[in-house]
């Protein structure tokens, strides 16, 4: 039996660091403090990332791709900190970094595996193409390839089209779903397993409303508690679809608590907004107000779409005048 103090040589300690595209990260490395410290950071064992010895940086042979992007924690080197501060990581920076630290009495080598992820906030869009209605979940830039799942009335859908275009350093993905004639609710989830980040889009169709000209209509829009967190920044947009395109009626920004209204007949109840109820009223309806009204509540983690179909019919007076 080996005594407790016995251990076998492990060539290198290895750590995994996950960074986000264009953000700064720290590659960790520690050593038992000593004098005459030498620190070399290398990429894939060949490209020189950062060198330090005799009390200062020596970057003459630094690979150009790291220029002005690396630094050490100089005040902490004497305490055994050889970590590298790395600015604006890109997908090309992914790989294995080796930190060599030498002192008068010890030599240490640490290995850090850097993985870089991208997850630009996805969107859920509702589109009409001729007579068909589509929900599209899309993410402009994502890496690695995400997992996209669709549910209809909380039941997973196996049919899942994915249109993918790959750029040099990330994927752009569209996942369309034909929902023509459906009154079901739909949910789309996009998951970046590396960044452990999930985004959810939810679409709900409300029952159609029939109104008379000159009346007013109240359209509900309340977020589902499962997703909604009032502490997180979000945006609410009400829009109306006319001839296949949406025009924005009003929007609300939670960060500034600002409401911008583009349609004079539109009204929002401030008290309801404070209670996270974004239902709206449209006054003095006219025939051209018939159509689809979309409430979009969006944050970095979700998009909640609620759609109302409004039919405005001529009032009796109008009909008798005709």
């Amino acid at each position: 039996i080996f005594p407790l103090a016995f251990f076998i040589y492990v060539p290198m300690n290895e750590q995994i660091v996950i960074g986000r595209l264009d953000e700064d990260i720290i590659l960790p490395s520690s050593f038992e403090r000593g004098s005459e410290v030498v620190i070399h950071w290398k990429y894939q064992d060949s490209y020189k990332v950062h060198s330090y010895y005799k009390g200062s940086d020596h970057l003459e042979s630094q690979d150009p791709r790291y220029a002005n992007r690396t630094s050490l924690f100089y005040n902490e080197i004497q305490n055994g900190n050889a970590s590298l501060f790395f600015r604006r990581v890109s997908l090309l920076d992914e790989g294995i970094y080796t930190c060599y630290v030498g002192t008068a009495i010890q030599v240490i080598t640490n290995k850090v595996v850097l993985k870089v992820g991208v997850f630009l906030t996805p969107v859920m869009k509702y589109e009409k193409r001729n007579t068909n209605s589509f929900l599209i979940c899309s993410v402009l830039s994502v890496y690695p390839r995400p997992i996209i799942t669709w549910k209809m009335d909380n039941t997973p859908i196996s049919e899942n089209n994915m249109e993918e275009t790959g750029s040099l350093d990330s994927f752009s993905i569209n996942s369309p779903l034909n929902i023509t004639g459906s009154n079901s609710s739909y949910e789309c989830t996009i998951e970046n397993s590396l960044l452990k980040q999930t985004w959810t889009g939810r679409w709900t169709m409300k029952d159609g409303l029939h109104k008379m000209q000159s009346e007013h209509v109240s359209l509900s829009c309340q977020p589902v508690n499962d997703y909604f967190s009032p502490n997180q920044d979000f945006k609410v947009t009400w829009s109306r679809m006319k001839s296949g395109t949406f025009s924005v009626l009003a929007y609300y920004l939670s960060s500034s608590q600002n409401t911008i209204i583009n349609e004079s007949r539109f009204s929002w109840n401030k008290e309801l907004i404070n209670q996270s109820d974004f239902s709206m009223n449209l006054m003095d309806l006219n025939l051209s107000d018939s159509g689809e009204y979309l409430c979009n509540i969006s944050s970095d983690e979700y998009t909640l779409l609620t759609i109302h179909t409004v039919h405005v019919e001529p009032s009796q007076e109008t009909a008798s005048h005709n």
Partner: antibody
């Protein structure tokens, strides 16, 4: 005073393994990296790698990757180097040497002869 | 790996002579060079590190100099006990590498 005392000479057949020990005294064993350096007959010095008794990641020479195993027993301030799949060109004197990036103190050397 | 090329491979000198041994690195090693002395059947002994810092107990006749890729060990006045083989080593980065050695013999 600092002393590094190595195990005796070994004769091994090709394909076998050899384990050399290095018992230290006179300094705090866990503070220093223990390196292994070999010297073939009439040749120069070749660094094989090091081990940190305090369990920090240790450096090694890729040339020996997969063949060399370095271990320590801190309770008796002793380092070990095992070289497997021996070949005739592994015939050399094997030294343990303590220090950081330069080697302050050396063992007396262990001659390992690989011969069929 | 960084190559260390030592010259000459051997030299003959007399007691009292000034002896110079050079070592050329395949890349800039930022003065991270050590020198060792080895006598037959013995382990090497550290003389100098960081190109010009003498190790404890090393006589002042041994001195080191250099920068970048070129380094020199000088013995100002050769003594009988200095006849040995001398090795340079770069301690800039792993794998640590040695020169092939310079044997200093009695003329």
């Amino acid at each position: 005073q600092v002393q590094l005392v190595q195990s005796g000479a070994e004769v091994k057949k090709p394909g076998a393994s050899v384990k050399v020990s290095c018992k230290t005294s006179g300094y705090t064993f866990t503070e220093y990296t223990m390196h292994w350096v070999r010297q073939a007959p009439g040749q120069g010095l070749e660094w094989m790698g090091g081990i940190n008794p305090n369990n920090y990641g240790a450096p090694y020479n890729q040339k020996f990757k997969g063949r060399v195993t370095m271990t320590v027993d801190t309770s008796i301030s002793t380092a070990y180097m095992e070289l497997s799949r021996l070949r005739s060109d592994d015939t050399a004197v094997y030294y343990c040497a303590s220090g950081g990036y330069y080697f302050d103190y050396w063992g007396q050397g262990t001659l390992v002869t690989v011969s069929s | 790996d960084i190559q260390m090329t030592q010259s000459p491979s051997s030299l003959s000198a007399s007691v009292g002579d000034r002896v110079t041994i050079t070592c050329k690195a395949s890349q800039d090693v930022g003065t991270a060079v050590a020198w060792y002395q080895q006598k037959p059947g013995k382990a090497p002994k550290l003389l100098i590190y960081w190109a010009f810092t003498r190790h404890t107990g090393v006589p002042s006749r041994f001195s080191g100099s250099g920068s970048g890729t070129d380094y020199t060990l000088t013995i100002s006045s050769l003594q009988p006990e200095d006849f040995a083989t001398y090795y340079c080593q770069q301690h800039y980065d792993t794998p640590f590498t040695f020169g092939q050695g310079t044997k200093v013999e009695i003329k």
